[in-house]
């Protein structure tokens, strides 16, 4: 572990209440193929424990979805991954809208610091699928 | 190679017959920019040779496609990546539907074991593009 | 640095003139969360400085976009990432069309050589968002 190979792959646990756009994650072999090796979960949000550049990736699939259901809403359903705490480092890292699709998937390299907590905010009225092959979120330390 | 840097990037060889949803892959410098360094192909399916956590990624583009062609089919075209053998470890790892799009692309971290064979199942009547910049599938060992 | 951990994450600087489909990138801590550690920029294009297999990833979001704006154009908006110089190694590595979506995101493993310059060509009349969480491009050296 001293090599700094911090890595995590999470599955969706639940969504928050109406006024909380955050997705709440869970991980661990007992749950399936999710795991945390280095990073940790704090009330369903992923906290980084080692400074470095990370590859952050996410896929979210909407649960009851057709191309019409995503397009007919006035406010498009949007997924944003960002640092939500500490407040001094708050920033949006990655953002996608669903438009006429039912799945978004992306990845990016970004510097993260020990103590950064990542939030994944799903705005809109549509709910995500909890199937572990459709919705997942992960980080991988790639270099100092 | 002893570092365990197993890695592969594959290009589409062909689709299976009508009752076989699997995509059949090929790899090697003579074919273009595809390669296998560690993993191997077994009848067009990717077999893992080293235990570890892998980043699995895929992009599939449909060959003759418009947003209407993907939306007008009763059974949506879906791509699923999973472990198909050994049977005891069979599981879907990653799944996406095309809805009104013509390309899906995603990636995820997942533990894989020596002998796991990965299958990529494309269900529906639409066929994938065989262009090497539009359809590809790869894995990268990232840690034990 | 001798480990060969070359890595870069870039943000969009600007688009080229009408007859130049290339996107022009920029990177560096002063600009936000983008950085270059090994690769370098040559007139806004990313140049590789170390041979190896790289994970190349990109996300591009169109700036003023709805599903109708991407679908109603005769020539669909397409993003292609390729080696544009040296000419002898020119090849398209990764290609996606927007169809009825407003964001494309993908990634792939590919061998790159010192001196390879990567170009990202956006064809069509729609312009990309310069928001750093919506449009970004990066490479990561993963093995020799």
């Amino acid at each position: 572990e001293s090599l700094g190979w911090d890595i995590a792959e999470l599955q969706l646990n639940h969504t928050g209440p109406q006024q909380d756009p955050r997705l709440y994650w869970q991980g661990g072999p007992a749950l399936g193929r999710s795991f945390l090796r280095g990073p940790e979960l704090d009330k369903g949000q992923l906290r980084i424990r080692r400074d470095g550049i990370y590859m952050v990736h996410i896929q979210v699939t909407l649960a009851i979805c057709s191309s019409t259901s995503t397009s007919r809403h006035h406010h498009p359903t949007t997924l944003a991954v960002g640092i939500c705490s500490p407040a001094s480092r708050s920033i949006s890292l990655l953002r996608l809208s669903f438009h006429q699709g039912c799945t978004i998937a992306s990845q990016r390299l970004t510097p993260l610091a020990r103590g950064d907590t990542l939030c994944t905010n799903l705005t809109g009225t549509l709910l995500p699928s909890r199937n572990t092959d459709e919705t997942f979120f992960g980080v991988q330390w790639v270099r100092p | 190679e002893s570092l365990g840097w197993d890695i592969a990037e594959l290009q589409l060889n062909h689709t299976g017959p009508q009752q076989d949803p699997r995509l059949y892959w090929q790899g090697g410098p003579a074919l273009g920019r595809s390669f296998l360094r560690g993993p191997e192909l077994d009848k067009g399916q990717l077999r893992i040779r080293r235990d570890g956590i892998y980043m699995v990624h895929i992009q599939v583009t449909l060959a003759i496609c418009s947003s209407t062609s993907t939306s007008r089919h009763h059974h949506p075209t879906t791509l699923a990546v999973g472990i198909c053998s050994p049977a005891s470890r069979s599981i879907s790892l990653l799944r996406l539907s095309f809805h009104q799009g013509c390309t899906i692309a995603s990636q995820r971290l997942t533990p894989l074991a020596r002998g796991d064979t990965l299958c990529t199942n494309l269900t529906g009547t639409l066929l994938p593009s065989r262009n090497t910049d539009e359809t590809f599938f790869g894995v990268q060992w990232v840690r034990p | 640095e001798s480990l060969g951990w070359d890595i870069a994450e870039l943000q969009l600087n600007h688009t080229g003139p009408q007859q130049d489909p290339r996107l022009y990138w920029q990177g560096g801590p002063a600009l936000g969360r983008s950085f270059l550690r090994g690769p370098e920029l040559d007139k806004g294009q990313l140049r590789i400085r170390r041979d190896g297999i790289y994970m190349v990833h990109i996300q591009v979001t169109l700036a003023i976009c709805s599903s109708t704006s991407t679908s109603r154009h005769h020539h669909p908006t397409t993003l292609a990432v390729g080696i544009c110089s040296p000419a002898s190694r020119s090849i398209s590595l990764l290609r996606l069309s927007f169809h009825q979506g407003c964001t494309i995101a993908s990634q792939r493993l590919t061998p790159l050589a010192r001196g390879d310059t990567l170009c990202t060509n956006l064809t069509g009349t729609l312009l990309p968002s310069r928001n750093t969480d919506e449009t970004f491009f990066g490479v990561q050296w993963v093995r020799p």
Epitope: - | T15, P17, Q19, A63, I64, S69, R130 | -
Partner: antibody
Framework: EIQLVQSGPELKKPGETVKISCKAS????????MNWVKQTPGKGLKWMGW????????TYADDFKGRFAFSLETSASTAYLQINNLKNEDMATYFC????????????WGQGTTLTVSS | DIQMTQTTSSLSASLGDRVTISCRAS??????LNWYQQKPDGTVKLLIY???RLHSGVPSRFSGSGSGTDYSLTISNLEQEDIATYFC?????????FGAGTKLELK
């Protein structure tokens, strides 16, 4: 050796029903779908559709929805094409065809069954 | 539906000739183009699939090429047993469609 052997020529009157058989041998019948192709002198080859030999689910091309039916007798490794309420335009040669490794690429064909419709 | 057009319905050639048969699709079919041979007795055989891949057992004098909408089948050195009708077929989307055929005859 893989073979598809079709039933013999048929002479029918308009309004009657015909059932053409295609017996497969040399492979596991339920592993590969069976396709049907119509050949007329004036209009060449026309794909009629196919039947999933594992599930029995048929898929018909638009021009062959209604009077046409694909069916199976799995125990006999045989696929059938039935045409109801025969019309003069049904007069043609009908082929069954099977893929090997590639989707929609037919490398095994029956010898064809000629259907004559005449009053 | 994708229309497949074989503009030449019949073609006369001599033994030993190089013969090219063309086929045009009404839209880009992404190289999912197959060629079949039908002998005068009605027997149908696959010759070439995916534009240029030779089916096993097919003589190497047969070759295929093309891209986008335009494709061709070439017989480099015509032999007596090649006298037949040749059909192209798009295999990219349903319904599958065939060309009207090109009948090859001896001069």
């Amino acid at each position: 050796e893989i073979q598809l052997v079709q039933s013999g020529p048929e002479l029918k009157k308009p309004g009657e029903t015909v059932k053409i058989s295609c017996k497969a041998s040399g492979y596991t019948f339920t592993n590969y779908g069976m396709n049907w192709v119509k050949q007329t002198p004036g209009k060449g080859l026309k794909w009629m559709g196919w039947i999933n030999t594992d599930t029995g689910e048929p898929t018909y091309a638009d021009d062959f929805k209604g009077r046409f039916a694909f069916s199976l007798e799995t125990s006999a490794s045989t696929a059938y094409l039935q045409i109801n309420n025969l019309k003069n335009e049904d007069m043609a040669t009908y082929f069954c065809a099977r893929e090997e490794d590639y989707r929609y690429v037919f490398n095994y064909w029956g010898q064809g069954t000629t259907l004559t419709v005449s009053s | 539906d994708i229309q497949m057009t074989q503009t030449t319905s019949s073609l006369s050639a001599s033994l030993g000739d190089r013969v090219t048969i063309s086929c045009r699709a009404s839209q880009d079919i992404s190289n999912y183009l197959n060629w079949y041979q039908q002998k005068p007795d009605g027997t149908v055989k696959l010759l070439i699939y995916y534009t240029s891949r030779l089916h096993s057992g097919v003589p190497s004098r047969f070759s295929g090429s093309g891209s986008g909408t335009d494709y061709s089948l070439t017989i480099s050195n015509l032999e007596q047993e090649d006298i037949a009708t040749y059909f192209c077929q798009q295999g990219v989307t349903l319904p599958l469609t065939f060309g009207a055929g090109t009948k090859l005859e001896l001069k």
